[in-house]
Amino acid sequence: TLNSVLINSNAIKNLPPPLGGAGGQPGSAVSVAPGVLYEGGNKYQTLDNYQPYPCAEDEECGTDEYCSSPSRGAAGVGGVQICLACRKRRKRCMRHAMCCPGNYCKNGICMPSDHSHLPRGEIEEGIIENLGNDHGAGDGYPRRTTLTSKIYHTKGQEGSVCLRSSDCATGLCCARHFWSKICKPVLKEGQVCTKHRRKGSHGLEIFQRCYCGEGLACRIQKDHHQTSNSSRLHTCQRH
């Protein structure tokens, strides 16, 4: 089941890198090849076309998105979930997070909320209505809350969930790690990195590596000779 969804990638720096985060030196140059992923908001996109962003929970998607299986009815049977555009007013829904900001799910329909001035998380915390869900978890989905208010009162340590690199402590970046985006160490000299070569080859990125640290570049390992170009090992090397 992995072949169709798993492609290694580096987590590309925020543009520009966040101050105090792990995105490298402020104002540092970022080389972005065509089609390479960059972090836009909290989902990875290519510079020329949108790539679906895998997720495990609604909290990992943007406020205008929810987390679900891309094919109707496929959730709950192990399908990979992605962030999907939120449902507008009068569209069908199964839980509040599916509805766009200013709306909530009532009787299976996205309805306008009287509390549209409140943050989305707070609206939903106050509405105790469970109309089922389309997640693989199979349990009643909790009201959506913002990760930033719940988790990021301190900078994330290695392995903790994050939305973007600025959520992580110095020396760490925010990158997908199968089940969530977590804070991972920025790569050191000699460590394996991932170099994107082909546009549109990213697929659903389930495992991402951080970028190489300051003064390092992701290059083919000189002594690594393999017949297949696609399997050449890249490591972080001095400029």
Epitope: T1, A56, V80, E158, V161, W179, K184
Partner: antibody
Framework: QVQLVESGGGLVQPGGSLRLSCAAS????????MSWVRQAPGKGLEWVSG????????HYADSVKGRFTISRDNSKNTLYLQMNSLRAEDTAVYYC?????????WGQGTLVTVSS | DIALTQPASVSGSPGQSITISCTGT?????????VSWYQQHPGKAPKLMIH???NRPSGVSNRFSGSKSGNTASLTISGLQAEDEADYYC???????????FGGGTKLTVLG
């Protein structure tokens, strides 16, 4: 430092139930996925279940699906595993593990024995 | 289902280097280039030694190194010491649904 302490193991008859707990300390519990891994006597490691940081997303090994339920209480920094319809083959040491950069911290385990 | 295969046992003398292999199907180790290694002493909990094929968590001796070629990942222990005698497990992930998959384990015996 990170610490995970399992409890709740013991002897139970086939078909019976048991609830394991894992008390976590030394890290922000609500920021990490958690999981249970078991090891039958003299055997290798077998992943049992995983749960997301908020508890809304759960995953199970086929061997326990429908019988075991993983849950967590972030206010108590505690992970749980409710085990129903226990079978002899569920006899094992059960470890709770933090899913950080992989299973980066483990508890010392609690022994569950299913026997008549 | 994906599967990871390890040798049941390996042995070496103090000071020597040994390598433990972990062979997977194309959809796990070879497919997405990610494997972790754990060390487990008798009666103790497993300990993460290597992640992402070759990265050591802080506190792990640099005598432990990991690599991967094709569908086989390898754990190499150099300058073998008596305390390295333990069981070693490779591990990978399936994501649909999320499931950790372990190799059968390799018992390392340090001779002498």
């Amino acid at each position: 430092q990170v610490q995970l302490v399992e409890s709740g193991g013991g002897l139970v008859q086939p078909g019976g139930s048991l609830r394991l707990s894992c008390a976590a300390s030394g890290f922000t519990f609500s920021s990490y996925w958690m999981s249970w891994v078991r090891q039958a006597p003299g055997k290798g490691l077998e992943w049992v279940s995983g749960i997301s940081y908020s508890g809304s997303n759960t995953h199970y090994a086929d061997s326990v699906k429908g019988r075991f339920t993983i849950s967590r209480d972030n206010s108590k920094n505690t992970l749980y595993l409710q085990m129903n319809s226990l079978r002899a083959e569920d006899t094992a040491v059960y470890y709770c593990a933090r899913m950080g950069i992989d299973l980066d911290y483990w508890g010392q385990g609690t022994l569950v024995t299913v026997s008549s | 289902d994906i599967a990871l295969t390890q040798p049941a046992s390996v042995s070496g003398s103090p000071g020597q280097s040994i390598t433990i292999s972990c062979t997977g199907t194309s959809s796990d180790v070879g497919g997405f280039n990610y494997v972790s290694w754990y060390q487990q002493h008798p009666g103790k909990a497993p300990k993460l030694m290597i992640h992402d094929g070759s990265n050591r968590p802080s506190g792990v001796s640099n005598r432990f190194s990991g690599s991967k070629s094709g569908n086989t990942a390898s754990l190499t222990i150099s300058g073998l010491q008596a305390e390295d005698e333990a069981d070693y497990y490779c591990q990978s992930w399936d994501v649909s649904p999320i499931t950790a998959v372990f190799g059968g384990g390799t018992k390392l015996t340090v001779l002498g």
